[in-house]
């Protein structure tokens, strides 16, 4: 066969679908690799061909489009399963070609089993809701294109294993699920089951997502430096180890980049000719507020180092703050016997 532009196996789209449910999979060529769409390709005389490699096999084989009840079919650039079976798992290839042109891409399709409580190996999308923020909604995802707008499906929502009805602050509204006031107790997995008729058959679409309740932008504040502070003085003798923690609290802010850094005499620690190490740790609260701690460490501090200015800085989308650590040289205690002897005029 003549040369074909092979885009390889596209794992950026690891497609997972539930067993015994309809699945519609668009050929990724038109979405991510080619500069034209299916209609343009079709009118230019190009044909879209589908084939697959079963799981744990090397042999590419054509897809059987002559199964009973058209279980697998192709419509434009979409491959349809009505419904899927477990052994449909494999790598699928769509190839666009005519006598002079050829381009193809493969992608993995995994058919996944679920239990009666919707638990499965499916990777779940996460939807973040702001705590105590007023009415917020989640929408049943990835159901477009499965049925025409004239069909009115029935939608049932579940939290974990339990059907959502008469919940205090969670109300099903068709494809949407409304949270009147989101609380930590609303964290969990939510599933919508969409049931619709087609050609005398009934199909179910199951979609699960994880809800995570996070800090509200109403309560967000600029970074707060807990340490260093005015109450702690880092008093050291030359030769001792100097350890100064910079501990900063950051309110949760969607996608905000939180930064913590030390400057020594106004410079980046690396730019000072002393042996400084900085180690950072990060922890999160239940609402994803973040605490970052950066420990500045000088193994053997000199009297010169103890005169320097050590400033902890923090920055988030809410603002920037800085705080200097109080560092000083320990005044040596009087050496008692010598001092006393001198006091008594001993020679």
């Amino acid at each position: 066969s003549e040369r074909c532009d092979d885009w390889g196996l596209d794992t950026m789209r690891q497609i997972q679908v539930f067993e015994d449910e309809p699945a519609r999979i668009k050929c990724p060529l038109f979405e991510h690799f080619l500069k034209f769409n299916y209609s343009t390709a079709h009118s230019a005389g190009l044909t879209l061909i589908w084939y697959w490699t079963r799981q744990d096999r090397d042999l590419e084989e054509p897809i059987n489009f002559r199964l009973p009840e058209n279980r697998i079919s192709k419509e434009k650039d979409v491959l349809w399963f009505r419904p899927t079976l477990l052994n449909d798992t494999g790598n699928y290839t769509c190839m666009l070609r005519n006598t002079t042109y050829c381009s193809k891409v493969a992608f993995p399709l995994e058919v996944v089993q679920k239990d009666s409580c919707f638990n499965s190996p499916m990777k779940l999308p996460v939807h973040k809701l702001y705590i105590e923020y007023g009415i917020q909604r989640i929408t049943c995802p990835n159901v477009d294109g499965y049925f025409p707008s004239s069909v009115k499906p029935t939608i049932t929502w579940y939290m974990g294993c339990y059907k959502i009805q008469n919940f205090n602050n969670v109300i099903p509204e068709g494809m949407n699920l409304s949270f009147l006031i989101a609380l930590i107790s609303n964290n969990g997995n939510y599933t919508c089951v969409v049931t619709y008729p087609e050609n005398g058959r009934t199909f179910h679409l199951t979609r699960t997502l994880t809800v995570k309740v996070v800090g509200s932008p109403k309560n967000a504040v600029p970074p707060v430096i807990h340490s260093p502070n005015d109450h702690v003085v880092y008093e050291k003798e030359p030769g001792e180890e100097l350890l100064i923690p910079c501990t900063v609290y950051f309110s949760f802010l969607m996608d905000s980049r939180n930064e913590v850094w030390w400057t020594i005499d106004g410079k980046k620690p690396d730019d000072i000719t002393i042996d400084v190490t900085i180690n950072e740790s990060i922890s999160h609260s239940r609402t994803e507020d973040e605490t970052r701690t950066q420990i500045l460490s000088i193994k053997k501090v000199t009297s010169e180092d103890l005169k320097r200015s050590y400033v902890c800085h923090a920055r988030s989308a809410k603002g920037e703050v800085a705080k200097a650590a109080k560092v000083k040289q320990k005044v040596p205690a009087p050496r008692y016997t010598v001092e006393l002897a001198c006091g008594f005029g001993a020679t």
Partner: antibody
């Protein structure tokens, strides 16, 4: 001398995986985050993600979540990026760079040219 | 994600001429950073925190702006300034770069 060293080039077949390396020297490796940036021929810069060698915390650009995996080896002061299921779209120069606080990307590696071809 | 739009995409200037290039953000950002890249080499940090010059950057360069509109200015173009300049936002994830402004010498 403060530097980030990367191999010059890698040639890999479509569908395979490759691990790119970035060796840090001349500074305390654990004090800086290591970032990876992609640049396709004649195109702009795309941020892939970052890793903190101190605690291994990573943040990825959603676009590269299923494509790149970042790791570090503190003992050799080396950062790694594994790029999986390679396609010709992955052919690019990959740079490692570092940041500390507001000192953004103040040091870059020379870049590794990755070519995906059968 | 925040999209950064740089303009113009390509520009040219005579030696001694004043040059201004802009970077617009799709949402407000706290700071803008600029990198310079010459053909075949890695990018170099050029201006950070909107207006601070990285070490070794000539004083003829300056940066300004706030919110969604930022700019890089060269007071007097020199031959060595010919390069591609990228703006970058760091306020939110993912970190994003502009598509670059290619500055050529006339």
């Amino acid at each position: 001398q403060v530097q980030l060293q990367q191999p010059g080039a890698e040639l890999v077949k479509p569908g395979a995986s490759v691990t790119l390396s970035c060796e840090a020297s001349g500074y305390t490796f654990t004090s800086y985050w290591i970032h990876w940036v992609k640049q396709r021929p004649g195109q702009g810069l795309e941020w892939i993600g970052e890793i903190n060698p101190s605690h291994g915390h990573t943040t990825y650009n959603e676009k590269f979540k299923n494509k790149a995996t970042l790791t570090v080896d503190k003992s050799s002061s080396t950062a790694y990026m594994q790029v999986s299921s390679l396609t010709s779209e992955d052919s690019a120069v990959y740079y490692c760079t570092r940041h500390y606080g507001s000192y953004y990307f103040d040091l870059w590696g020379q870049g590794t040219t990755l070519t995906v071809s059968s | 994600q925040i999209v950064l739009t740089q303009s113009p995409a390509i520009m040219s200037a005579f030696p001694g001429e004043k040059v201004t290039m802009t970077c617009r953000a799709s949402s407000s950002v706290s700071y803008m950073h600029w990198y310079r890249q010459k053909s075949g080499t890695f990018p170099k940090r050029w201006i950070y925190d909107t207006s601070k010059l990285a070490s070794g950057v000539p004083a003829r360069f300056s940066g300004s702006g706030s919110g969604t509109s930022y700019s890089l200015t060269i007071s007097s173009m020199e031959a060595e300034d010919a390069a591609t300049y990228y703006c970058q936002q760091w306020s939110t994830n993912p970190i994003t770069f502009g598509a670059g402004t290619k500055l050529e010498l006339k």
